[in-house]
């Protein structure tokens, strides 16, 4: 039960995280015009990974895409790449983890296979989260560097009659969304990896031996395993521990409301 909960929660947390990474990547507010210690402007500039926008106090907003690929800074290209890699890995991880969920039965998939898939998706989520955090952090570092460079420029060369106010940029909302989303994806991945340990079968597998008695059935497991005693007309054996081996009676799996084929 704890394993299923951990796996399910890991999946949900990762899903929210990846949705956040996608949102952050698409957002225009990666950097916003710094208004502190600046004249109050009637024109506000903010920039994303894909386009730059200008919002006038009249309410009119104009956005222009970066239609060049070669003319863009290498750092911006790197951030784009990291975010896209994060999204792709996250999406694949989500796809894998859906099939790995314990509450979902797909044919007669072994628990060992589910464990492997859970581990795979967990690792993908961790890498996806790290990509997003790295991408956002690289962009933030770029902003900080440019901010202090432009601050230095503001206080030099002001001897002329006409002043040109240097536009400085600070952290936009997308950075915070990216950091949180990356963190959530990372946490979700860790949870999936933890759940994988609980799903993994024991080192030694024993085939259960059934002894059918008239009136009731007792399934015995060698090596001191728990025995289950079922009373009544039902002669089917109750599953005690499935380490990959099954009794003849257990080969058929019964559909439930959680089954997805």
């Amino acid at each position: 039960m704890a394993v299923t909960a951990c796996q399910g929660l890991g999946f949900v947390v990762s899903l929210i995280g990846i949705a956040g990474i996608i949102a952050a990547t698409c957002m225009d507010q990666w950097s916003t015009q710094d208004l502190y210690n600046n004249p109050v402007t009637a024109v506000f500039n903010y920039q994303g990974l894909w386009r730059s926008c200008v919002r006038e106090s009249s309410g009119f907003t104009e956005c222009r895409g970066y239609f060049t690929l070669l003319g863009l800074p290498a750092m911006l290209q790197a951030v784009r790449a990291l975010m896209i890699v994060g999204i792709v890995l996250g999406a694949i991880g989500l796809l894998v983890s859906i099939f790995a969920l314990k509450c979902i039965r797909i044919g007669s998939m072994e628990d060992s296979a589910k464990a492997n898939m859970t581990l795979t998706s967990g690792i993908m989520f961790i890498v996806s989260g790290l990509c997003a955090i790295a991408g956002v952090s690289v962009f933030a570092n770029m902003l900080v560097t440019n901010f202090w460079m432009s601050t230095a420029n503001m206080y030099t060369g002001m001897g002329g009659m006409v002043q040109t106010v240097q536009t400085r940029y600070t952290f936009g909302a997308a950075l915070f969304v990216g950091w949180v989303a990356g963190g959530l994806t990372l946490i979700g991945g860790v949870m999936m990896c933890i759940a994988c340990r609980g799903l993994a079968p024991e080192e030694t597998n024993y085939k259960a031996v059934s002894y059918h008695a008239s009136g009731h059935s007792v399934a015995y497991k060698p090596g001191g395993f728990k025995a289950s005693t079922g009373f009544g007309s039902n002669t089917k054996n109750k599953k005690i521990y499935d380490g990959g081996a099954r009794t003849e009676d257990e080969v058929q799996s019964y559909p439930s409301k959680h089954d997805y084929v």
């Epitope: 109050v40 402007t41 009637a42 024109v43 730059s52 200008v54 106090s57 009249s58 002043q163 106010v165």
Partner: antibody
Amino acid sequence: EVQLVESGGGLVKPGGSLRLSCAASGFSFSNSAMSWVRQAPGKGLEWVSTISSGDSYTYYADSVKGRFTISRDNAKNSLYLQMNSLRAEDTAVYYCARQGYGNALDYWGQGTLVTVSS
Amino acid sequence: DIVMTQSPDSLAVSLGERATINCKSSQSLLQSGNNKNYLTWYQQKPGQPPKLLIYWSSTRESGVPDRFSGSGSGTDFTLTISSLQAEDFAVYYCQNDYYYPLTFGGGTKVEIK
């Protein structure tokens, strides 16, 4: 057709108060930033105040800061300018205007005269 | 505050002639994000409210005759009336639309010569 009609002007003693109103029609008032501009007799134009479309931001000229308050009622398509502690230098024709592209004032009312005199 | 300086204060021009009005701002009105200059030109006739002519320093408002044109960038701007008509005699104002307070120039009166 866009229409802006100012009202509420008149003669007031120094230190007194007055509330100007501007009734808007013919455009999406709630989505437009609005401004007040004044013109003293025989003088040039002076921007007074601006209010953003969402009511979030208000801006004032230094000469009126702390004395004038701009506000709007989107339900009534109305813009207001509450003027307190009026001075002789506040005597002017007050225009209500809509901000358009480039923050330019693209539509203006006919103006209302405010005279501050003892 | 941004200071807007218009020149000349008044201008006497004959009908059909070219009129040029200059406007200088104390700070650049160029927004690098969209490469637009936030400078606006208005025309005001006696007893009337101002009328918008040009915004973004060079974009004509709809309905404004094409004899009116705006140019300039950064801090120096010009309004040109290519062939003056009788209805063009008025006072012209430039306005900073980039920084609050949204300051106006002192105005230029265009008179008949």
